[in-house]
């Protein structure tokens, strides 16, 4: 008789979901030489430990410092990029700008994007069937955890200009229910943090709008400014030319606005 | 019985060296974390410095930094502290511990040796 | 000077229930779990609590643990003569090289 499972609403552990997770650590550890120090298996071992076995609904920041302290890098603190709902640019741009890092440039971010887990209580099973979804289910489960431990860290570690990518293609381009909205900013140190600089994407090709402009970003200019922090924003209109341009900065066409 | 013994203390001379040992049994040495925690005399319970089961990674406290080298042989369930440079300061009972298990399900010392004296 | 501040001592009388603080911040106790350790005179300190609430086996229902954000308590009810003791919290630091970090200890007297 099959053992009764708890069936969330979320997609269940990706598949190979340890085997990918320790792939990846090898693969990021020999790719930085700053790393190499760095046991991949243990760092597994940490990962498993902050959720297997425990309730997927009662996962907390304190489970996965075993897994912080093992992944603990020093990224160059003035040259941090945070992003929201526009990873895919953000990523294509600090694969060009190298000396530029978003969260999952690091070690703990790359072992986890675009990945799903999560455990059962008092079983030392991993879930393939279904995982909590952070709205119908639960916000506290492993991988949202997660990523509110590693962003919020990120953020704190960051100082002088940080700057953050926002799709000006969305409804809300600052939502203060995303990830940045919600643990990055508010986790920025103003004693480190001078100026927080958003580039407003824009998507449509003819798109000549002001987006710094938008409500939301003036929401969260008070938000930052409250928090004694510096605002600039810049709007990026031809996102395609932005990103051959620190490809190519010396391309004459690049003196123009992009 | 689950044990950790810890050896080699004694009274050495400002900027001498002196190599604590803490045979462990009872317990599977190679799954566990292991500490070194300090006490001066009449003083509270310092930490001085933790190795991962593996012994890949180790961390100091600040004040023994560059100085003290935490180490194990899974082989022979035995954790070390070679302590170099040493100062007044350092003066204390030692103690090993059993640290975080590499279930990762706690994180506390849960096994203490019976200290060892280190004189300086 | 000690990252997480405790009373340096704390009394009561046999019976009552006697309750020790240890305050942190969020780089400490916030984020991370604290567990207490009692040391009698002269012996090596013992685990009374971890992971913030949990009890070893072994350690009386009388001693209790918890959290709630950058500061914890250790609470011993029914208070006993042999519960004279020191008492330390700990917990991991977040600081990069850094690891463990106690408490400078609360010197409990049972009157």
């Known amino acids: 008789v099959p053992r009764w499972r708890q069936q969330w609403s979320g997609p269940g552990t990706t598949k190979r979901f340890p085997e990918t997770v320790l792939a990846r650590c090898v693969k990021y550890t020999e790719i930085h030489p700053e790393m190499r120090h760095v046991d991949c298996q243990s760092v597994w071992d940490a990962f498993k430990g902050a959720f297997i076995s425990k309730h997927p609904c009662n996962i907390t920041e304190e489970d996965y410092q075993p897994l912080m302290k093992l992944g603990t890098q020093t990224v160059p603190c003035n040259k941090i990029l945070l992003w929201s709902r526009i990873k895919d640019l953000a990523h294509q741009f600090t694969q060009v700008q190298r000396d530029m890092f978003t969260l999952e440039d690091t070690l703990l971010g790359y072992l986890a994007d675009d990945l799903t887990w999560c455990g059962e209580f008092n079983t030392s099973k991993i879930n393939y069937q279904s995982c909590p979804d952070w709205r119908k289910d639960c916000s506290n489960n492993p991988v949202s955890v997660f990523w509110k431990t590693v962003s919020r860290r990120f953020a704190e570690a960051a100082c002088d200009v940080v700057h953050v990518m926002l799709n000006g293609s969305r409804s809300k381009i600052f939502d203060k229910n995303s990830t940045f909205g919600s643990v990055e900013v508010h986790n920025l140190q103003p004693e480190k943090v001078q100026t927080l600089e958003a580039w407003v994407i824009h998507g449509g090709r003819e798109d000549s709008r002001d987006l710094c402009q938008d409500p939301t970003i003036k929401e969260l200019e008070s938000i930052i400014s409250k928090r004694n922090i510096q605002f600039s924003c810049k709007n990026i209109y031809r996102p395609d030319k932005f990103l051959q341009c620190v490809k190519n900065p010396e391309d004459s066409s690049c003196t123009s606005e992009i | 019985e689950v044990q950790l013994l810890e050896s080699g203390g004694g009274l050495v001379q400002p900027g001498g060296s002196l190599r604590l040992s803490c045979p462990a049994s009872?317990?599977?040495?190679?799954?566990?974390?292991m500490t070194w925690v300090r006490q001066a005399p009449g003083k509270g319970l310092e930490w001085v410095s933790t190795?991962?089961?593996?012994?890949?990674?180790?961390w100091y406290a600040d004040s023994v930094r560059g100085r003290f080298t935490i180490s194990r042989d899974n082989s022979k369930n035995t954790l070390y502290l070679q302590m170099n440079s040493l100062r007044a300061e350092d003066t204390a009972v030692y103690y090993c511990?059993?640290?975080?298990?590499?279930?990762?399900?706690?994180?506390?010392?849960?096994?203490w040796g019976q200290g060892t004296t280190v004189t300086v | 000077q000690s990252a997480l501040t405790q009373p340096p001592s704390a009394s009561g009388t046999p019976g009552q229930r006697v309750t020790i603080s240890c305050s942190g911040s969020?780089?400490?106790?916030?984020?991370?779990?604290v567990s207490w350790y009692q040391q009698l005179p002269g012996t090596a300190p013992k685990l009374l609590i971890y992971?913030?609430?949990q009890r070893p086996s072994g350690v009386p229902d009388r001693f209790s643990g918890s959290k709630s954000g950058t500061s914890a308590s250790l609470a011993i009810s029914g208070l006993q003569s042999e519960d004279e003791a020191d008492y330390y919290c700990a917990t991991w630091d977040e600081s990069l090289l850094g690891l463990w970090v106690f408490g400078g200890g609360t010197k409990l007297t049972v009157l």
């Open positions: 992971n913030n609430v």
């Open positions: 969020s780089s400490n106790i916030q984020y991370s779990y």
């Open positions: 190795i991962t089961d593996s012994g890949g990674r180790a």
């Open positions: 511990a059993r640290d975080t298990p590499k279930t990762y399900y706690y994180y506390a010392m849960d096994v």
């Open positions: 009872g317990f599977d040495f190679s799954s566990y974390w």
